[in-house]
Every structure is written in structure tokens, then in C-alpha cells.
């Protein structure tokens, strides 16, 4: 699987999950999130050659098409597959609130 | 929606579905498909700015991150959303077979 266990341990050029730390204030301009100050959102990148963790028949066909026709601009793209939530602390007035934001952390990628 | 109805009628730079005709023999090297000779598989391409048909909270956050930090390499990618099947005719020996291949035609795209 193109997940953090594999991708973070290997120098992989092809589609894989990459580490990306986002600082809420500096990178997003968010002051409203009290904790954490930031988090590893991660992202997916890298080429999607034929048979590379293809999502659908279309992405497999497109991967084959691109491999056989490398001058073509059409190719599958490396995108998130499994995502996890992030728990944050914020305030409404002076009242602290704990919320779980869904689909915030990329754990693995696929070619779509 | 970033679908064929809109995208094929407009010169759209951002994420949209694009027409792509694939000839089974010439483009894929497939001799086994008897009919059709080819089909419009289509593909998704174009930048994914903030608010552009985002798939998840992560893709919205990443779109915001990329908009505020344009030098960053991390950004959402334009990928298929809705796909349709394709019916093909092929032969097993001299016996004709009709099969519906799922997820072969891209009808719309999203930013993921």
C-alpha cells in the first residue's frame, strides 16, 4: 500500500504520500484553532505509471495509454485514498469546544 | 458541476473533464476488443484553486494552503468523480461475448 509506513521510509519517486506540516496561523492564516498549533496534513504526489495502485478501470486504462503514448498529456493523478480525522480545540466566546474534523490527514494514496 | 455538459462547451483552464478518444488497437495495442474500435474515455485536468469542487476537508485545506502559499508544491489534483461503463464485444475462440466494463468513461471531475 502507498501509505505512510512505506512512503515515509523509502525514497519513492512514483505516487506516494508525502509529509506536509501545516501551521494553522502561518500557513492558513487561522487564529481560531487554539490547539494544536499545526498538524501533519500530508499530501499525495508522484507519477502514476501503469499498474501503480490504480483506483478504477479508467485509471488503469489511462496508465496504460500514457505508458504507451508518453507524449500524451492525459495521465492518472496521485490522490488521497485513506484519510483520518484531527481533533482540535477552539473557543466560542470564552467556552472551549473540542471538535473532530473529518478527513484532515492523508494516510495513503492511489492513482485515480 | 465539472461535467461534460459544461466542460466540453467552455474554454475552462481550471479542473474540468477533457475529451480523450482512445483507439483500442492504435493507442492501447489491444486486438482482443472487436467492437467498438475505440471510445471517448476522457480525462480530468486543470488547476484546483480554493473552492473548486473540493472532495474532502483535506482538499479544501490544501487548496487554501496552496492559494496562500503559491510557491508550495502541494496542491489538490483534478480527478474523475462520476464514471460510466462501456459495453464491448469480444471473442472467446469463435464465440462472441458482450461485456460491460465498469468505470471506463469519465463524466465529471473533482479536486481531491
Amino acid at each position: 500500500a502507498l501509505d505512510t509506513n512505506y512512503c515515509f521510509r523509502n525514497l519513492e519517486e512514483n505516487c506516494c504520500v508525502r509529509p506536509l506540516y501545516i501551521d494553522f496561523r502561518q500557513d492558513l492564516g487561522w487564529k481560531w484553532v487554539h490547539e494544536p498549533k499545526g498538524y501533519y496534513a500530508n499530501f499525495c504526489s508522484g507519477p502514476c505509471p501503469y499498474l501503480r495502485s490504480a483506483d478504477t478501470t479508467h485509471s488503469t486504462v489511462l496508465g496504460l495509454y500514457n505508458t504507451l503514448n508518453p507524449e500524451a498529456s492525459a495521465s492518472p493523478c496521485c490522490v488521497p485514498q485513506d484519510l483520518e480525522p484531527l481533533t482540535i480545540l477552539y473557543y466560542v466566546g470564552r467556552t472551549p469546544k473540542v471538535e473532530q474534523l473529518s478527513n484532515m490527514v492523508v494516510k495513503s494514496c492511489k492513482c485515480s | 458541476a465539472l461535467d461534460t455538459n459544461y466542460c466540453f462547451r467552455n474554454l475552462e483552464e481550471n479542473c474540468c473533464v477533457r475529451p480523450l478518444y482512445i483507439d483500442f488497437r492504435q493507442d492501447l495495442g489491444w486486438k482482443w476488443v472487436h467492437e467498438p474500435k475505440g471510445y471517448y474515455a476522457n480525462f480530468c485536468s486543470g488547476p484546483c484553486p480554493y473552492l473548486r469542487s473540493a472532495d474532502t476537508t483535506h482538499s479544501t485545506v490544501l487548496g487554501l494552503y496552496n492559494t496562500l502559499n503559491p510557491e508550495a508544491s502541494a496542491s489538490p489534483c483534478c480527478v474523475p468523480q462520476d464514471l460510466e461503463p462501456l459495453t464491448i464485444l469480444y471473442y472467446v475462440g469463435r464465440t462472441p461475448k458482450v461485456e460491460q466494463l465498469s468505470n471506463m468513461v469519465v463524466k465529471s471531475c473533482k479536486c481531491s
Partner: nanobody
């Protein structure tokens, strides 16, 4: 339920100025990411400018140096100062607010028409 109301649109000559305003109600306005989006006839909506609760802003290339986005969290308002307007700026302009909790949701105003013509 967040409600957004835009104002300030109208007809203006090329090179002229307009100031769009957006008033929000029904939400912790200070938390949301605000944006202006526009839609020209037959086109998809496109992001024009955005501003976060921490006052980080960004603009689409075609309006950089001409448009300025600002917000006032105490008054629950956002503005877009548009200078040196061009015919290609003609569109319906929408105020957009993205709230992130409890789940991400985009709220859209009804839009205000901006027409740049001589």
C-alpha cells in the same frame, strides 16, 4: 444557519471603481474563511479573493493590484474594493463563507451584479 447578503454592485465605466460589501449573520463570523467568487455568463464560478480570520489574503492573478479584500469581525462584514475595473470583470459577485466546524460547509450569498461597460 449563516446568512450572507451582498451589496454595492452596479453599472460602472471601464477604469471606474466599486466597493462590494457582505454582511453575515447567524454564525461565529470571526472563525470563518471569507471569499469573493464571481460568475460570468456561461462560465463556472471562479475565486476572486479570499481572507482568513487571521487576515491572510490572496487574489486571483487577473485582479492583483486592482482589488483589495478586507473584513471586520466585530461588524461581521467583508468588503471588496475594486479599482480600475475592466469589461472582463463583468459578472455576478458572490460572498462565500467557509465554516470548518462541526463539519466543513460553504455558505453562499445571493450575489450582486457588476457590469463594466461604456
Amino acid at each position: 444557519q449563516l446568512q450572507l447578503v451582498e451589496s454595492g454592485g452596479g453599472l460602472v465605466q471601464p477604469g471606474g471603481s466599486l466597493r462590494l460589501s457582505c454582511a453575515g449573520s447567524g454564525i461565529a463570523f470571526s472563525r470563518v474563511t471569507m471569499a469573493w467568487s464571481r460568475q460570468a455568463p456561461g462560465k463556472q464560478r471562479e475565486l476572486v479573493a479570499l481572507i482568513t480570520d487571521g487576515n491572510r489574503s490572496a487574489y486571483v492573478d487577473s485582479v492583483k493590484g486592482r482589488f483589495t479584500i478586507s473584513r471586520d469581525n466585530t461588524k461581521k462584514t467583508m468588503s471588496l474594493q475594486m479599482n480600475d475595473l475592466k469589461p472582463e470583470d463583468t459578472a455576478v459577485y458572490y460572498c462565500v463563507a467557509t465554516d470548518w466546524v462541526p463539519t466543513r460547509r460553504d455558505y453562499w450569498g445571493q450575489g450582486t451584479q457588476v457590469t463594466v461597460s461604456s
